[in-house]
């Protein structure tokens, strides 16, 4: 279970659209799939496919659903309680330090190293030194541009709040 979870944008409700009102907030909070009304008296449903909330909350607006970028595939659609899950296309990966884009996996390891891990949607190929068996973390020649792997990063983006 990874730890790369990014804050999502707040999406103002479209005032013209009909809003489904639910029961009053409990302890000032509304259940997942809802947000609180401006006067704090009602819980209003998020709009399926448009926005969502994953937790009990006092959000004034639900969170805007992520749209998968080109170069990504949609693993699961956005619901009122869960954001879209996007994953990098085959041959590309998303690293923790730049979660906003998928990067091409390296095609091979630098000289003197062997491949011990394949390209996945969340990590580059993994290379180790032939002799020592230690992972590669330094610079390599410019022709083999290195991208640091980030194993364990989930299909992204996803939202997490505590």
């Amino acid at each position: 279970e990874s730890a790369l979870i990014t804050q999502q944008d707040l999406a103002p409700q479209q005032r013209a659209a009909p809003q489904q009102k639910r029961s009053s907030p409990s302890e000032g909070l509304c259940p997942p799939g809802h947000h609180i009304s401006e006067d704090g008296r009602d819980c209003i449903s998020c709009k399926y496919g448009q926005d969502y909330s994953t937790h009990w909350n006092d959000l004034l607006f639900c969170l805007r659903c992520t749209r998968c970028d080109s170069g990504e595939v949609e693993l699961s659609p956005c619901t009122t309680t869960r954001n879209t899950v996007c994953q990098c296309e085959e041959g590309t990966f998303r690293e923790e330090d730049s979660p906003e884009m998928c990067r091409k996996c390296r095609t091979g390891c630098p000289r003197g190293m062997v491949k011990v891990g394949d390209c996945t949607p969340w990590s580059d190929i993994e290379c180790v030194h032939k002799e020592s068996g230690t992972k590669h973390s330094g610079e390599v020649p410019a022709v083999e541009e290195t991208v640091t792997s980030s194993p364990g990063t989930p299909a992204s983006p996803c939202s997490l709040s505590g």
């Epitope: 279970e1 730890a3 790369l4 979870i5 990014t6 804050q7 707040l10 409990s26 302890e27 909070l29 609180i36 994953t54 937790h55 009990w56 909350n57 006092d58 959000l59 004034l60 607006f61 979660p99 997490l160 709040s161 505590g162």
Partner: antibody
Framework: QVQLVESGGGVVQPGRSLRLSCAAS????????IHWVRQAPGKGLEWVAV????????YYADSVKGRFTISRDNSKNTLYLQMNSLRAEDTAVYYC???????????????WGRGTLVTVSS | DIQMTQSPSSLSASVGDRVTITCRAS??????LAWYQQKPGKVPKLLIY???TLQSGVPSRFSGSGSGTDFTLTISSLQPEDVATYYC?????????FGGGTKVEIK
Amino acid sequence: QVQLVESGGGVVQPGRSLRLSCAASGFTFSYYGIHWVRQAPGKGLEWVAVIWYDGSNKYYADSVKGRFTISRDNSKNTLYLQMNSLRAEDTAVYYCARGRYSSSSWWYFDLWGRGTLVTVSS
Amino acid sequence: DIQMTQSPSSLSASVGDRVTITCRASQGISNYLAWYQQKPGKVPKLLIYAASTLQSGVPSRFSGSGSGTDFTLTISSLQPEDVATYYCQKYNSAPLTFGGGTKVEIK
């Protein structure tokens, strides 16, 4: 009274296990994501783990991943932290903290327990 | 991972002084920053969230500002009860990261 109370700390040898508990009262426990945060003696704060309100998702700091397991029992208003393969560097006061998910922010902690001290030493 | 760097690590000021603590993120975090106060032997207490929103019950002499990578906690008039260590924390994404802390003492 709105509070979190940790228990289960103590002295343990390296490589052994310990389970911490955090009892919640005064609020609806099942509405909140709850975190563990630790503080080594004389040091700063370090986030350890979080579990979602319904237990459906758990996330860990790299330093404890694969060794610690966070869980909860909403029927008992209790949070747990199972700590295995303990190391000297895990010595710290462990706090449980309530995470806040609101219109202006998500991840800050608005309620902390008093903490329980875990000492890993041979 | 995003690193949070606080400065200074400690400071000493007189009662009534204006005290400023800074927190810098290694990458932009919008305004997803909280400040906590931890008095000696006590539990951390939330002071400010969303970079500048004062938590209920916190004295108005505390204020926060900043966005992106640079943030500031200001105590407009230092009081004896403000002796504590102050921590910033970013919460735009996991892992949640705290600054190293700033210890505030009275001269």
